[in-house]
């Protein structure tokens, strides 16, 4: 019997300082570019090597960005979200949602090393 996949959802405030080449990540999503079905939220699709986000280390690909400098990202067109980041200034505060996949064992869990497992 297969274990089911659950998700552990956590939120975090990440403060980034814009580097010489900017914040250093890509986004997907928006009301006109739904990346996740039935969710027009904004998600991180790429972290650029040696960019501000990569050097900070906390923002991850797949994270959902809930707000930028306190401004909610709900119900935004994709380009409006991009522009919000571009105009966010030198010090940028991101409220993000991490979604960590957790593999649960099957019901009637067998101990490690059990060859029938």
């Amino acid at each position: 019997m297969n274990g089911r996949v659950d998700y552990l959802v956590t939120e975090e405030e990440i403060n980034l300082t814009r580097g010489p080449s900017g914040l250093g990540f890509n986004i997907v999503g928006g009301t006109d570019q739904q990346y996740v079905s039935n969710d027009s939220g904004i998600y991180v699709s790429r972290i650029k090597e040696n960019g501000a986000a990569a050097l900070d280390g906390r923002l991850q690909e797949g994270d959902k960005i809930l707000s930028v400098n306190g401004q909610d990202l709900k119900n935004l067109l994709h380009q409006d979200a991009v522009d919000l980041f571009r105009n966010a200034g030198y010090a940028v505060s991101l409220r993000v949602q991490h979604r960590l996949q957790v593999q649960n064992g099957p019901i009637g869990h067998r101990g490690e090393g059990d060859p029938s497992g």
Epitope: F25, N26, I27, V28, D32, Y35, V82
Partner: nanobody
Framework: QVQLVESGGGLVQAGDSLRLSCAAS????????MGWFRQAPGKEREFVAH????????YYADSVKGRFTISRDNAKNTMYLQMNSLKPDDTAVYYC?????????????????????WGQGTQVTVS
Amino acid sequence: QVQLVESGGGLVQAGDSLRLSCAASGRTFSTYTMGWFRQAPGKEREFVAHINWSGSSTYYADSVKGRFTISRDNAKNTMYLQMNSLKPDDTAVYYCAVTIGSPVDSYRHGDPLEYDYWGQGTQVTVS
């Protein structure tokens, strides 16, 4: 993993036209930021054109402006480069390139490091 396959290259005469295609894998094609680059023998890879996720924004190298047109069909997972009034200087291997999503920083269209996935290229020769 994104896979890109270019097609449409060939041998043509100066003044002729060609249309290159770049077919991409992945269900999220409509989120891709895409570009065309080219590399002539003995030269560095050179930026040609760029298109945003929706096709509403395009950008061209000065050397091709007014002659080349970049476009995309998100329903077909394909990007195109229509090349008119071809010149011998346009002879090169043409590559399509992709990054997933839109950069939140001012986009450096011509920087190959902005792109994560590359096709194998298609040869264009203008005699």
